[in-house]
Amino acid sequence: PEPPTACREKQYLINSQCCSLCQPGQKLVSDCTEFTETECLPCGESEFLDTWNRETHCHQHKYCDPNLGLRVQQKGTSETDTICTCEEGWHCTSEACESCVLHRSCSPGFGVKQIATGVSDTICEPCPVGFFSNVSSAFEKCHPWTSCETKDLVVQQAGTNKTDVVCGPQDRLRA
């Protein structure tokens, strides 16, 4: 581990002395001196600082721009930033969630493996043998082919990854 520095945790070194850092939610107004303590002031409305700090300006809360498909997931405080998420049917383009894009739909032949959230896109997977999807959808999984046997029917047309099997009546062979 690094050896300790001349000032303790939650302190900073300035002009040969250790001054207290400002607590989260407050900004630095003036450094301490030999005769005075560090002077801090609370961040204003729509501002925050999330660490012990010596910042002279608070950071502005993130703006969740509805024109970019964003909405507020969690309102910011003096100690935390606003958290944005996307409107229903949309998801963030990055971890910082600065803009949104429409959830992707899975094409015919593909089904939804994982439904999209506000922060992640739809995950599609190809329909395996025995399954199909005949629609473009952001919700539908691959469906299993109809089992003709359980309906006392026979396969008249084989299924594909995009189409279900077609069942038909069994040929009645006369003795």
Partner: antibody, heavy 116, light 107 residues
Framework: QVQVQQSGAELVRPGTSVKVSCKAS????????IEWVKQRPGQGLEWIGV????????NYNEKFKGKATLTADKSSSTAYMQLSSLTSEDSAVYFC?????????WGQGTLVTVSA | HIQMTQTTSSLSASLGDRVTISCRAS??????LNWYQQKPDGTVKLLIS???RLHSGVPSRFSGSGSGADYSLTISNLEQEDIATYFC?????????FGGGTKLEIK
Amino acid sequence: QVQVQQSGAELVRPGTSVKVSCKASGYAFTNYLIEWVKQRPGQGLEWIGVINPEFGGTNYNEKFKGKATLTADKSSSTAYMQLSSLTSEDSAVYFCARGGGGFTYWGQGTLVTVSA
Amino acid sequence: HIQMTQTTSSLSASLGDRVTISCRASQDISSHLNWYQQKPDGTVKLLISYTSRLHSGVPSRFSGSGSGADYSLTISNLEQEDIATYFCQQGNTLPWTFGGGTKLEIK
């Protein structure tokens, strides 16, 4: 009154080490940082590092990392600077000073001469 | 590292003169600027801290001013005992750095 008293001049061989002491009096030793400064003959002042005597925490000028080691003994109100692997470049006057809004009180300086 | 520049390395003045010594930092140091006096015998004293705060026991003929990156030390009525080298030092950002010094001599 505040006083900062340093150890006497040293004549040392190249490759060896030297330890300079700095005894403080007239104030609470653990309440103020101790700063160390180098001055080569006819030259300016160069900051070496700082120590907090309360718990021994230090900050060094990158240039002096591995060259200078700062320590402090609370019981005797004395700070120390050890200089290792001495060369002619280390020949200088070394000052200690009490911190607290600038280098508020200085020692008289310790002349270290490195010579074969 | 913050560079401290004292453009005048030596200065001649007469007793009773008003003398100004300047010091410039390579960036804003937020008034964390100190002035030191080094006498010919090598002893060093703090004169002024935080740009303008006179250290205890320092005569009131010494004063300091400045902000941002530009600072100055003024001796309003030069006396014989003021013959010394004067150094500025920034205490805003590690590593602490000093100006090269201004040597004050009597004309």
